[in-house]
Amino acid sequence: AWELTILHTNDVHSRLEQTSEDSSKCVNASRCMGGVARLFTKVQQIRRAEPNVLLLDAGDQYQGTIWFTVYKGAEVAHFMNALRYDAMALGNHEFDNGVEGLIEPLLKEAKFPILSANIKAKGPLASQISGLYLPYKVLPVGDEVVGIVGYTSKETPFLSNPGTNLVFEDEITALQPEVDKLKTLNVNKIIALGHSGFEMDKLIAQKVRGVDVVVGGHSNTFLYTGNPPSKEVPAGKYPFIVTSDDGRKVPVVQAYAFGKYLGYLKIEFDERGNVISSHGNPILLNSSIPEDPSIKADINKWRIKLDNYSTQELGKTIVYLDGSSQSCRFRECNMGNLICDAMINNNLRHTDEMFWNHVSMCILNGGGIRSPIDERNNGTITWENLAAVLPFGGTFDLVQLKGSTLKKAFEHSVHRYGQSTGEFLQVGGIHVVYDLSRKPGDRVVKLDVLCTKCRVPSYDPLKMDEVYKVILPNFLANGGDGFQMIKDELLRHDSGDQDINVVSTYISKMKVIYPAVEGRIKFSTGSH
């Protein structure tokens, strides 16, 4: 028998520095977790102790903090090289700055293979990108070889900006021939490494003949065997065992997100490359693990540019941006309108001639808007200003909901109106009318939504049984502020871009902004 140790990360999302337990900015260093310096300490410790070790990343290193905003992927290549990653799969967020924003900073600079078998380049891009990412890579490990085959969510065109010259194929259809090719090359130990979410990971384990292990990402899935060491609740045991269609046990793993854990999986193979057994657990990277001094020093050196960036002007406002709780928790506020407009603008994807866009709606809890911005400072807006408005380091995500769920959400928005509570919703692509004289749960008297399957966008009444795409904060997608119906009833959830980054990009693009209060939210009494 031959033993392999797989160390893995996924959905790190720009958390190069250590973070607090909830993966936001580190405040009390003695309680902080993760970060590449601490990760390196643990990886090196395992490399020294064990003979056959692979360090893999399942995508979405891009996007999530000011590190990505400023360095645009150069930081990912630099620190992943420093940690000596063995391979990475492309995630959807790797395309956030377009194909060029992937090729130049990452693909050309990475000293490790970057993989995806289901992304096919066409047209002029095919020659430009050729060899910069691969469908699979055969890695020597000790005296053996291990094949790593990559995959990426086929929803990427709806979630990011891969452009028109990349085709995202069905994962299973694309993986099988590549695995077959590895088998003909006498590679008998094969890891599928990819970024399509836990459900697809399990399907790959079940359906792709010859895959021995699946290392996944995208769904931020936390798996654990035994008593979990922090706040994350396990979605299942680690590894999660899938029975393949041919009757094998195929271990499937994921390691939550944000670099908080290092996935640790030990696989025992027989002489024919079949998995005999697998066991392990994610390792919580808490403060009991010291940060590596040389990596930490490098982080501090790179950090300097971030502090300078925070105070630079992104754009100007010529109106007061009312983000006060007195406004945003009671009525339509122009800061809410600005943020929602930025959220929709960030999700413009013309992927189908029948649709002007795939999503037109935004909802945003008023309680998530934490500060106004005064225009009487020469109109200047900085990252620092936006960090006061959106201090929680969240993301603006894409969900699919039934109309009936949206209706419940808007009823919840005003179920205890007048108490300055955070659940009052700001909106984009939605016209809502409330009648507060009616009893809670029955106060929404009109709810019109902007069409997507139209050449001239207009507002139509919400249909209860129709499925709608909506952009909203991850806080709401996870049921925050009492929006349990969203969490319980959502049909799909894809995590999006860092909230501040979305708004800062929009302001930079617009240069001068003047959001108004324009009748998106209205109140009526009696018949309207």
């Epitope: 399907l203 359906k207 029975t243 041919d246 009757g247 046990k249 024919r272 079949n274 005999i276």
Partner: antibody
Framework: QIQLQQSGAELARPGASVNLSCKAS????????MQWLKQRPGQGLEWIGA????????RYTQKFKGKATLTADKSSSTAYMQLSSLASEDSAVYYC?????WGQGTLVTVSA | DIQMTQSPSSLSASLGERVSLTCRAS??????LNWLQQEPDGTFKRLIY???TLDSGVPKRFSGSRSGSDYSLTISSLESEDFVDYYC?????????FGGGTKLEIK
């Protein structure tokens, strides 16, 4: 080619135990679930349980917990099922099976 | 445990006829369903795995499909050797479970 060779017919007294074997060849014995099934004359199939020889993991249908015990010997690529406290309703043909290959079955007859 | 309800339990049909057997799953089993054939001498053969994939060597007249929680085995044109017993098996979660079986008889 893949073969599952089961042991011969068993005649046993009520209350006794029998040990059925299933010798596997032509594939990696440790890396596939081995299932055991029961079929009484003229009846349908019942799924008893399965063993994963690589790590010894076993799964049983509730009804057969305590009745059947599954083991595997990696060195001889043989799976075993012991049936204990035999009663007349245990008289049946027992099959070992992979997902795509089946043994020829072992007839167990329980009679006083 | 997941219940698999197989229907019909017996079926009389003629040579060349098209027939369908159905298994209904009590819970979601995805595509984790096999169809098995048992000869009169007790030997078993898997016809279809993963709901719709034909095993090698199985004639093309056999096909598998799914509609919601209903899984079907269709034989497009019956031949004499097809008049045997058929079972579905779900392997989505332990304990695996069989349908009650269908006896296909010649009219």
């Amino acid at each position: 080619q893949i073969q599952l060779q089961q042991s011969g017919a068993e005649l046993a007294r009520p209350g006794a135990s029998v040990n059925l074997s299933c010798k596997a060849s032509g594939y990696s014995f440790t890396s596939y679930w081995m299932q055991w099934l029961k079929q009484r004359p003229g009846q349908g199939l019942e799924w008893i349980g399965a063993i994963y020889p690589g790590d010894g993991d076993t799964r049983y249908t509730q009804k057969f917990k305590g009745k059947a015990t599954l083991t595997a010997d990696k060195s001889s690529s043989t799976a075993y099922m012991q049936l204990s406290s035999l009663a007349s309703e245990d008289s049946a043909v027992y099959y070992c099976a992979l997902f795509s290959y089946w043994g020829q079955g072992t007839l167990v007859t329980v009679s006083a | 445990d997941i219940q698999m309800t197989q229907s019909p339990s017996s079926l009389s049909a003629s040579l060349g006829e098209r027939v369908s057997l159905t298994c209904r799953a009590s819970q979601d089993i995805g595509s984790s369903l096999n169809w098995l054939q048992q000869e009169p001498d007790g030997t078993f053969k898997r016809l279809i795995y993963a709901t719709s994939t034909l095993d090698s060597g199985v004639p093309k007249r056999f096909s598998g499909s799914r509609s919601g929680s209903d899984y079907s085995l269709t034989i497009s044109s019956l031949e004499s050797e097809d008049f045997v017993d058929y079972y579905c098996l779900q392997y989505a979660s332990f304990p695996y479970t069989f349908g009650g079986g269908t006896k296909l008889e010649i009219k």
